[in-house]
Amino acid sequence: TPLGPASSLPQSFLLKCLEQVRKIQGDGAALQEKLCATYKLCHPEELVLLGHSLGIPWAPLSSCPSQALQLAGCLSQLHSGLFLYQGLLQALEGISPELGPTLDTLQLDVADFATTIWQQMEELGMAPALQPTQGAMPAFASAFQRRAGGVLVASHLQSFLEVSYRVLRHLAQP
């Protein structure tokens, strides 16, 4: 059943999530800036067709619209999405020495956010019994594909985080 903002989520959890979303958004923006400055890959919209051919997936948040938010489904989709992005970021490993440290920090911050979501699901008795298995990740055949993949993954992740932020902020409203 849909649950509105007056749900059972603690304010401390929501504030922690908002913090983490903004930290990851900062990491993602740093990755995008470096890809743009170093490789002139500045416009994800120009790489959409390549994204389709590489099979870079999107993470849905269909259970999270503020008008009919389903708490368990929304948290589960948030966690699954973060789990997906962990795999996508892992596939980008070795993208370039200049981008390595930024990508490393982004990867860990996404993992930590997934942990925060899971902790809360566990406390509410909503945690799935088993970890979802990682689906097939895109294989990048060249350095260019990996860098272009980086632009698209960062762009997808930022979109996912923008929706997440709106949902969490809506839930955090008294």
């Epitope: 922690k16 913090e19 983490q20 903004r22 930290k23 900062g26 789990f83 962990q86 795999g87 892992q90 440290p101 490393d104 920090t105 990867q107 860990l108 993992a111 930590d112 956010f113 997934a114 942990t115 925060t116 899971w118 902790q119 566990e122 945690a127 970890q131 990682q134």
Partner: antibody
Framework: QVQLVQSGAEVKKPGASVKVSCKAS????????MHWIKQAPGQGLEWIGY????????NYNQKFRDRATLTADKSTSTAYMELSSLRSEDTAVYYC????????????WGQGTLVTVSS | DIVMTQSPLSLPVTPGEPASISCRSS???????????LYWYLQKPGQSPQLLIY???NLASGVPDRFSSSGSGTDFTLKISRVEAEDVGVYYC?????????FGQGTKLEIK
């Protein structure tokens, strides 16, 4: 309650390898990253790297990338750190510590494992 | 890598007196989300380190309120209002803004 129990002290010869284990209990093991930290005798703390057991992904401090290998066994809730081509400067206490965000980061530590490298 | 520098390295204190430890980072630890990613850990003799302070100024669970921490983006101070015998050990500042995580050299607090 959360517990991290590490394997016992090891004495190794230069050039050998060592594998230290860290058995976790009291929480859902794959959900949290596990970090490893080195403390040489009378020295400070040095971050080696971490393993994300849920996807088997490990990340390393550049200094340890060539010789450290971090793994995790979800079935036994155990994280491992293997150090190869040992030299005298690897003599240290090695700690595992559970990752997380905010007040969760390194809130739980193993008791430490002393690795002595001596000919 | 972000370099963390602590001072003093040794701090003899009389019980009941205040104590102060400084830590400086080579890069600002203040993120655009408003959080400063600076932590303090205490390693008591013969023990593993324990979390004292997270995100610059928040006391970890079970830490007495005689401990406090403040700072800017790069300069931080851990204060103990009245030192007790159980506070002896090595205090480390650490950053988790970015990888690799790095620690200060440690400050050894001892009772005079």
């Amino acid at each position: 309650q959360v517990q991290l129990v590490q394997s016992g002290a090891e004495v190794k010869k230069p050039g050998a390898s060592v594998k230290v284990s860290c058995k976790a209990s009291g929480y859902t093991f794959p959900i949290y990253t596990m970090h490893w930290i080195k403390q040489a005798p009378g020295q400070g703390l040095e971050w080696i790297g971490y393993i994300n057991p849920s996807i088997g992904y490990a990340n390393y401090n550049q200094k340890f990338r060539d010789r450290a290998t971090l793994t995790a066994d979800k079935s036994t809730s155990t994280a491992y750190m293997e150090l190869s081509s040992l030299r005298s400067e690897d003599t240290a206490v090695y700690y595992c510590a559970r990752g997380g965000y905010g007040d969760s980061l390194f809130a739980y530590w193993g008791q430490g494992t002393l690795v002595t490298v001596s000919s | 890598d972000i370099v963390m520098t602590q001072s003093p390295l040794s701090l003899p204190v009389t019980p009941g007196e205040p104590a102060s430890i400084s830590c400086r980072s080579s890069k600002s630890l203040l993120h655009s989300n408003g959080i400063t990613y600076l932590y303090w850990y205490l390693q008591k003799p013969g023990q593993s380190p324990q979390l004292l302070i997270y995100q610059m100024s928040n006391l970890a669970s079970g830490v007495p309120d005689r401990f406090s921490s403040s700072g800017s983006g790069t300069d931080f101070t851990l204060k103990i209002s009245r030192v007790e015998a159980e506070d002896v050990g090595v205090y480390y500042c650490a950053q988790n803004l970015e990888l690799p995580y790095t620690f200060g050299q440690g400050t050894k607090l001892e009772i005079k």
